[in-house]
């Protein structure tokens, strides 16, 4: 603790100019004071002034008023500083002395004589209010006041609390009368060193170094740091935690840039044809009769449906066609014959049956042949029976569908999930794609099936070829090669014509 006992001398009266021993001062009592402050004693005794002592220069002769003086010799009020916790009680001895010697340092002069003394014992609380008193004896009267105040930066009822206002990174506060800290606006904490962040700033994802600020931790954004940042390169996806890329409906792949619903998003099939999705950016158009081309954009010739029978040749006309019939046939489609069974019109071992009393005939064809005269070999693939881009193959009396990867069934109508057999190791995420399953690996693993454990910065060695971009971060320690147009493969090492382009997890 630290404080100051202050004593203000106001007036001293010694009208007869007498000393304590009854003698008079000649020519008058040149008066100075000695003050002794000590711990409380019920009976004041001689001994050290435990709380301090002070002397004044000569302040006047016989009777005089003592003026306030703030500095130099004869300072009033008198200051008795202490460096301990103020106990609240004290004993004070004020002595008036006459000196025949030096005005400024009478204490050192020989022949000093006591005029009078007073003793005060009691309690005194720390405070700014002066306690005024007056003491009389038979010869003298002393008016004075006193108080105890705390030294600068000390507070509390015993001046025991040190507090220094500050405004730096170890605290932003002022001091209350009791010595407690009063934080400056925008600061909090026991030492007022913690800034109060922008209202609403997310407690975990944001922080601040000064008031009304909201600095986002890695992976978060927004004014209040409550919005996650999706993985770099995420195109059609969102996140619920940082660096995620959860694909919007109809999108797939590591960056949600693989269009799984190309038909709906782009409507590539023309002229009323049917569009079927088949993996990222993959689709097939099933054309209506009369149209062809990858997108059914090409109108077929009117003769394309082979309307002329019995070997008639077809000629396109502006909005129609015309059949040129071979000898022995007539009609719009050469469907009528002038031949009879006698002309042996049935080919390929077909049996001829007379009709209309021999004026016409009908051929009964053996297996695998068709046509009015059994002239056509049966092609079971003409009806395009294979779905999802399957290839139709004639096999003797039957036909089979050769399905594309990911499809099965007699007509390739069933979609196979390559992910059903959980091919991805170490908790990898499986994606069904046109060319088979692809695994997105968790942190620390890589490989087509997440079977390789990684312990280094995967992109540091520059694993991607042909100008591909290497990514890490979605799965720390993995790398992803995002291939430029025209290259594919886990490291973009193959030109197109090999596996289809997809950013593989390596």
């Amino acid at each position: 603790g630290s404080g100051i006992f202050q004593l203000r001398l106001q007036e001293f009266v010694n009208q007869r100019g007498m000393l304590a021993n009854g003698q008079s001062c000649e020519p008058g009592c040149r008066t100075f004071f000695r003050i002794c402050l000590k711990h409380f004693q019920a009976t004041f005794s001689e001994g050290p002034c435990t709380f301090g002592n002070v002397s004044t220069p000569v302040l006047g002769t016989n009777s005089f008023v003592v003026r306030d003086k703030n500095s130099g010799s004869g300072r009033n009020p008198l200051q008795l500083p202490f460096n301990f916790t103020w106990p609240g009680t004290f004993s004070l001895n004020i002595q008036a002395w006459h000196t025949p010697g030096d005005d400024l340092r009478p204490e050192t002069s020989p022949g000093n004589s006591l005029i009078s003394q007073i003793i005060i014992q009691g309690s005194l609380a720390v405070g700014k209010i002066w306690r005024t008193d007056e003491q009389n004896d038979t010869l003298t009267r002393l008016s004075y006041s006193y108080r105890v105040i705390c030294s600068d930066n000390y507070y509390g009822e015993s001046c025991s609390r040190l507090c220094k206002k500050r405004d730096d990174h170890f605290g932003h506060y002022e001091c209350q009368p009791d010595g407690s800290l009063s934080c400056l606006p925008g600061w909090t904490g026991k030492y007022c060193d913690q800034p109060i962040c922008l209202s609403g700033c997310h407690e975990q994802n944001g922080y601040c170094s000064k008031p009304d600020e909201c600095i986002c931790r890695p992976g978060w954004q927004g004014r209040l740091c409550n919005e996650c940042i999706p993985h770099n390169g995420c195109r059609h996806g969102t996140c619920s935690i940082p660096w995620q890329c959860a694909c919007d409906e109809g999108w797939g792949g590591l960056f949600c840039d693989q269009d799984l619903n190309y038909c709906t998003h782009h409507s590539p099939c023309k002229n009323g044809s049917t569009c079927s999705n088949s993996g990222p950016k993959g689709y097939t158009c099933t054309c209506l009769p009369g149209y062809t081309g990858e997108h059914c954009e090409l109108g077929l010739s009117k003769c394309a449906s082979n309307p002329c029978r019995n070997g008639g040749s077809c000629k396109d006309q502006e909005n129609s066609y015309h059949c040129l019939c071979p000898p022995g046939y007539y009609g719009q489609h050469c469907e009528h014959s002038t031949l009879t069974c006698a002309d042996s019109p049935c080919f390929n071992g077909g049996s001829c049956r007379e009709r209309n009393q021999g004026s016409s005939y009908a051929c009964e064809c053996p297996p695998n042949f068709t046509g009015s005269n059994c002239e056509k070999k049966v092609d079971r693939c003409t009806s395009n029976p294979c779905a999802n881009g399957g290839q139709c193959q004639n096999r003797g009396p039957s036909r089979t569908c050769r399905c594309r990867p990911g499809f099965t069934g007699t007509h390739c109508e069933l979609h196979i999930s390559d992910c059903a057999r959980s091919p991805c190791a170490h908790g990898g995420t499986c994606h069904d794609l046109e060319n088979g399953p692809v695994c997105t690996c968790p942190a620390g693993f890589s490989g087509r099936r997440c079977e390789v454990r990684i312990t280094h910065d995967a992109c540091a060695s520059g694993p991607c070829f042909n100008g591909a971009t290497c990514y890490t971060g979605l799965s720390p320690n993995n790398f992803v090669c995002n291939c430029p147009y025209g290259f594919v493969g886990s490291r973009c090492e193959f030109p197109v014509g090999l596996p289809p382009s997809f950013p593989w997890v390596a």
Epitope: N153, L162, R166, D168, H169, F170, G171, G189, S209
Partner: antibody, heavy 121, light 106 residues
């Protein structure tokens, strides 16, 4: 008990960048009660405060060095680092890292053993 | 910039009292720390918050601070107290060290 350990090259060429790391053990660098400071002492001379950092990344630098100093923190490794660019022979000193305690009103109660960095070609 | 001034050296006989001063403008309004540094060693905090001693620091070390001057007092000085002593205060957000005082125990 908290321990601090400085590490980095003992020799740096003039005009290059001095880089030191202080590793804290026996306590978390992410405590809200501490700042983490760098102090240097040229041979035969007194102590000079360089700057300090809070675990959130807030930094404070000596104005006389501010244009050349960068202090950073890596809470995951319990480390903080000093970079001093464009060094000259006058930057030759023993570099100390220390913990500055808010409760001690900024007093540094734990110091590293110091590492001598000499700037010379 | 803020400066703290210390006497370059102080000599004291064993068992006597050594007083080291540290002067700076309105230093009494700042908290002062004192550090002891022996040759080839790191500084050690001996006084913080003007007069408080960290645990393990002997009672013969005491401090005070008022006006423009802070004082470190070593009473009953021992030969092991021979060292350099630095005062330190904060001026806004900058740490400031005194120039240091070499205490020699005669």
């Amino acid at each position: 008990e908290v321990q601090l350990q400085e590490s980095g090259p003992g020799l740096v060429k003039p005009s290059e960048t001095l880089s030191l790391t202080c590793t804290v053990s026996g306590g978390s660098i992410s405590s809200s009660s501490y700042y983490w400071g760098w102090i240097r002492q040229p041979p035969g001379k007194g102590l000079e405060w360089i700057g300090d950092i809070y675990y959130t990344g807030s930094t404070y630098y000596n104005p006389s060095l501010k244009s050349r100093v960068t202090i950073s923190v890596d809470t995951s490794k319990n480390q903080f680092s000093l970079k001093l660019s464009s060094v000259t022979a006058a930057d030759t000193a023993v570099y100390y890292c220390a913990r500055e305690d808010v409760i001690l009103r900024g007093g540094s109660d734990y110091w590293g053993q110091g590492t001598l960095v000499t700037v010379s070609s | 910039s803020y400066e703290l001034t210390q006497p370059p050296s102080v000599s004291v006989s064993p068992g006597q009292t050594a007083s080291i001063t540290c002067s700076g403008e309105r230093l009494g309004d700042k908290y002062v720390s004192w550090y002891q540094q022996k040759p080839g060693q790191s500084p050690v905090l001996v006084i913080y918050e003007d007069f408080k001693r960290p645990s393990g620091i002997p009672e013969r070390f005491s401090g005070s601070n008022s006006g423009d001057t802070a004082t470190l007092t070593i009473s009953g000085t021992q030969p092991m107290d021979e060292a350099d002593y630095y005062c330190q205060a904060w001026d806004r957000d900058t740490g400031v060290f005194g120039y240091g005082t070499k205490v020699t125990v005669l």
